[in-house]
Interface confidence: low
C-alpha cells in the first residue's frame, strides 16, 4: 500500500482591516510546526465588506452587525469547523477612525464597542478591536512586505522567488497609501535619528533593525482630495470650481457641509456664500500638480531634511515597495511596470487627465463613475507625494516597486499585525523570545 502523509496541522488567523473607505477581512494559514519560520504564513482569502468604512456607521451603529455578517460567514466556511475556536480574530482600525476619534472620542469608542460585540458572536477566538497608531500601521506594513520577500531569512537563496527579490538581505522600504493617511517606513543608512518620534528599533530573527516611520494623517488620497477642494474653493469667485484634477467635461455638485465634515479640512474652513458648489473638470495635469503641491508645507523644516509639514525624513535608502492605493491607482493607469520611467509616468498622466470625461466613461465602462472620476487626481497626487513629498527623483524612481501581492498575499499592514500579535516573529534566529507588542507603542 502507498504511504499516506500524515494530515498537516494547519493553523488559521483572521485580521480585519477597518480602513477609512472600506473594511477587508483577511484569512491567513500556516503549518503549526513551522510557525516561527520566516515566510510560511500566507493569505488564503480576502473578503471585502460591502459598504463604507466603519467610521461612517457612527450614526447607525445598529447596522454594524449586518455589515460584517457576509465576510464573517465566509470565514466560517473557509476555516474548518474544528479550527474555529482556536482561530484568533483581530480588528485594526486605521486613519478613518483616528479622524473620528479626533472629532469625538466618545463616538469612536461607541463604534468600536458595537464592532467588538458583533465579532464576539462568532465561534472564533476574538482578540479585540482597536484603533492602531499611524506608527504601527507603517511598521506592520514594513514587516509584512519584508517577511513575504524573505528578507528576514538568514538562508540566502540561490534562486529568486519573486521578481523583486534579490539575494541580498537589504530590507525594502514600505510606502502605504490609504484613503485617509499615508505611511513611509524604511531603514535609513544613518542609524542615528534626529526625531525619536519617527524611530523604531526591533530585533527580528537575530538581527537588529533601526527603522524610520511616519504616518501623515489627512494625506491619504481621499482626504487629500477633500483638502484640495477646501483649499481651492476659498478662492473661487462663485459656486463654480474649475478643477484641473478632473477630466474636461466632468461635472459634480458638492455640498459645503460634506466638504467641512472631516477634521482634515478644518484648516481651510470659511464661511461661503453658498451651500453647494459645482466642480467643472478642465483636465490639466500641470495645474493639478501645482494645486496638490500647495497641500505640502515645505517652507518650514526644523531638521536637516524634511518630507513636508516640518516632519523629519532621512535620505531615502534602498528599494521600496509601494502598495495599497499606490498600487491600485498605478495599476489602473497601467503604470506599475519597472520599465516605466518617472518622466514616462508624468507624460502618461498628462495625457490621461486631458482626455474628455465622455471618452473616459466609454473606455472604462465597467468602472464605477465615482472611482473613475478620481484617477486623474489620485495619479497626480501619488506623483506629487512621491516626488515632492518624499523626495524621490527621476533616478530613484526605479527603486519604487508597485506591489499588489507577494506570493499570493496582499501587501499591507494586516499580516505583520497578526505575526506580531500571535508571537510568530521571533527576536532570535532559533526559537527564542517573540517581538513584544509594546515595541510599537
Amino acid at each position: 500500500t502507498q504511504n499516506k502523509a500524515l494530515p498537516e496541522n494547519i493553523k488559521y488567523g483572521i485580521v480585519l482591516d477597518a480602513g477609512s473607505s472600506h473594511t477587508s477581512l483577511y484569512i491567513y494559514k500556516w503549518p503549526a510546526e513551522k510557525e516561527n519560520d520566516t515566510g510560511v504564513v500566507h493569505q488564503v482569502e480576502e473578503c471585502r465588506v460591502k459598504g463604507p468604512g466603519i467610521s461612517k456607521y457612527v450614526q447607525k451603529v445598529n447596522e454594524i452587525g449586518i455589515y460584517l455578517t457576509d465576510c464573517m460567514e465566509r470565514a466560517r466556511e473557509v476555516i474548518p469547523r474544528s479550527q474555529h475556536q482556536e482561530t484568533p480574530v483581530y480588528l485594526g482600525a486605521t486613519a478613518g477612525m483616528r479622524l473620528l476619534r479626533m472629532e469625538s472620542e466618545e463616538l469612536a469608542d461607541r463604534v468600536l464597542d458595537v464592532v467588538e460585540r458583533s465579532l464576539s458572536n462568532y465561534p472564533f477566538d476574538f482578540q479585540g478591536a482597536r484603533i492602531i497608531t499611524g506608527q504601527e500601521e507603517g511598521a506592520y506594513g514594513w514587516i509584512t512586505i519584508n517577511y513575504l520577500l524573505g528578507k528576514f531569512s538568514q538562508k540566502t537563496r540561490w534562486f529568486s522567488i519573486v521578481p523583486y527579490e534579490t539575494n541580498n538581505q537589504e530590507t525594502f522600504g514600505a510606502l502605504d497609501l490609504g484613503g485617509a493617511s499615508t505611511q513611509i517606513t524604511f531603514v535609513p543608512q544613518n542609524q542615528t535619528t534626529e526625531s525619536p518620534d519617527n524611530a523604531l528599533q526591533f530585533r527580528l530573527y537575530g538581527k537588529d533593525y533601526n527603522v524610520y516611520t511616519h504616518s501623515f494623517l489627512c494625506y491619504g488620497k481621499d482626504q487629500a482630495l477633500w483638502q484640495k477642494l477646501a483649499k481651492d474653493i476659498q478662492v473661487a469667485s462663485n459656486e463654480i470650481l474649475r478643477d484641473p484634477c478632473f477630466h474636461p467635461g466632468y461635472k459634480k455638485v458638492v455640498n459645503v457641509s460634506d466638504l467641512y465634515k472631516t477634521p482634515c479640512t478644518k484648516r481651510f474652513e470659511m464661511t461661503l456664500p453658498f451651500q453647494q458648489f459645482e466642480i467643472q473638470g478642465i483636465g490639466n495635469y500641470q495645474q493639478c500638480h501645482q494645486s496638490v503641491l500647495e497641500l505640502f508645507n515645505t517652507s518650514y523644516c526644523p531638521y536637516s531634511q524634511c518630507a513636508f509639514n516640518g516632519i523629519f525624513l532621512p535620505p531615502l535608502q534602498g528599494d521600496f515597495g509601494a502598495f495599497s492605493a499606490f498600487y491600485f491607482v498605478m495599476n489602473f493607469l497601467n503604470l506599475t511596470s519597472e520599465k516605466v520611467s518617472q518622466e514616462k509616468v508624468t507624460e502618461m498622466m498628462k495625457k490621461f487627465c486631458s482626455q474628455p470625461w465622455e471618452e473616459i466613461k466609454t473606455s472604462y465602462a465597467g468602472v464605477k463613475e465615482k472611482y473613475l472620476s478620481e484617477y486623474c487626481f489620485s495619479g497626480t497626487y501619488i506623483l506629487s507625494l512621491l516626488l515632492q513629498g518624499y523626495h524621490f527623483t527621476a533616478d530613484s524612481w526605479e527603486h519604487i516597486h508597485f506591489i499588489g501581492k507577494i506570493q499570493g498575499s496582499d501587501a499591507g499592514w494586516t499580516l505583520g499585525y497578526m505575526l506580531n500579535l500571535t508571537n510568530m516573529i521571533p527576536a532570535e534566529q532559533p526559537l527564542s523570545t517573540p517581538l513584544s507588542h509594546s515595541t510599537y507603542v
Epitope: 518620534d197 474652513e269 470659511m270 516640518g310
Partner: antibody, heavy 119, light 109 residues
C-alpha cells in the same frame, strides 16, 4: 480679520450665575472649537472647557463639570459660557479663544471679561 | 488631566538667551504630531500665541522665539532677549483637551 468681542464686566453675589458672551466676526464659529479660559488675579491660566459649535458638542474640565454650561448660536455667531453657584474664588478674567483642529494654531482670543464675585 | 510643570521665574539681560522649560506628566505626542503650544501674556492683555505644535512659529512672531522638544520635555527659547519680552510665558498641551503650565515670569535685568 477675525475678531472675538466679549460682553462687559460683571459683579455677582455668591451663589448667583453669570453668563458671558463671545461674538465672533470675520469667520463662522462652526470653523472652530471655541474654548473658555479663566485667570484669577495674579494667577495663571485655567482651561474651563470647549464647545464645537458645528455639532453642539461640549467638553468640560473636571473641576467645572457640574457648574459650567457652554452654548452657541450660529445665527448670531456667538458662543456663551454660563457659570453657576458662584463663589469668591470664581473672581477672574474669563477669555474665549478659537482652535481650528485640536493642536493646530490657536488663532484668536477675546479681550476678556472681568467677573467679580463679592457679597 | 495632563499636568504641566514650568520653571517659575527667570531674570535675563538684554541680548542674552532665555530658556524656559516645561515638563508634561505624560506624552503630548499623538500620531507623530506634538501638541504643545507656548503663549506670552503681558499685564492686562489676553495671551498671545508664540509657538504651536512644539516648534512652529505663529504668524507675526519674531524669529527670536523658538520651540523644541517632544514627548514630555519642552523648551521655549528667546534669543536674543529684548526689553519688550518682559512677560509671563505659558506652555499649553492640546493633545488631550487643554491644560496650561503654571507660567514662567521673565524679567529683563
Amino acid at each position: 480679520q477675525v475678531q472675538l468681542v466679549q460682553s462687559g464686566a460683571e459683579v455677582k453675589k455668591p451663589g448667583a450665575s453669570v453668563k458671558v458672551s463671545c461674538k465672533v466676526s470675520g469667520d463662522s464659529i462652526t470653523a472652530y472649537f471655541m474654548h473658555w479660559v479663566r485667570q484669577a488675579p495674579g494667577k495663571g491660566l485655567e482651561w474651563m472647557g470647549r464647545i464645537d459649535p458645528d455639532h453642539e458638542r461640549t467638553k468640560y474640565a473636571e473641576k467645572f463639570k457640574n457648574r459650567v454650561t457652554m452654548t452657541s448660536d450660529t445665527s448670531t455667531n456667538t458662543v456663551y459660557m454660563e457659570l453657576s453657584s458662584l463663589r469668591s474664588e470664581d473672581t477672574a478674567v474669563y477669555y474665549c479663544a478659537t482652535e481650528r483642529v485640536p493642536g493646530f494654531e490657536t488663532d484668536y482670543w477675546g479681550q476678556g471679561t472681568m467677573v467679580t464675585v463679592s457679597s | 488631566d495632563i499636568v504641566l510643570t514650568q520653571s517659575p521665574a527667570l531674570a535675563v539681560s538684554p541680548g542674552q538667551r532665555a530658556t524656559i522649560t516645561c515638563r508634561t506628566q505624560q506624552t503630548v505626542d499623538h500620531y507623530g504630531t506634538t501638541y504643545m503650544n507656548w503663549y506670552q501674556q503681558k499685564p492686562g492683555q489676553p495671551p498671545k500665541l508664540l509657538i504651536y505644535l512644539a516648534s512652529s512659529l505663529a504668524s507675526g512672531v519674531p524669529a527670536r522665539f523658538s520651540g523644541s522638544g517632544s514627548g514630555t520635555d519642552f523648551t521655549l527659547t528667546i534669543n536674543p532677549v529684548e526689553a519688550d519680552d518682559t512677560a509671563n510665558y505659558y506652555c499649553q498641551q492640546s493633545r488631550n483637551l487643554w491644560t496650561f503650565g503654571g507660567g514662567t515670569k521673565v524679567e529683563i535685568k
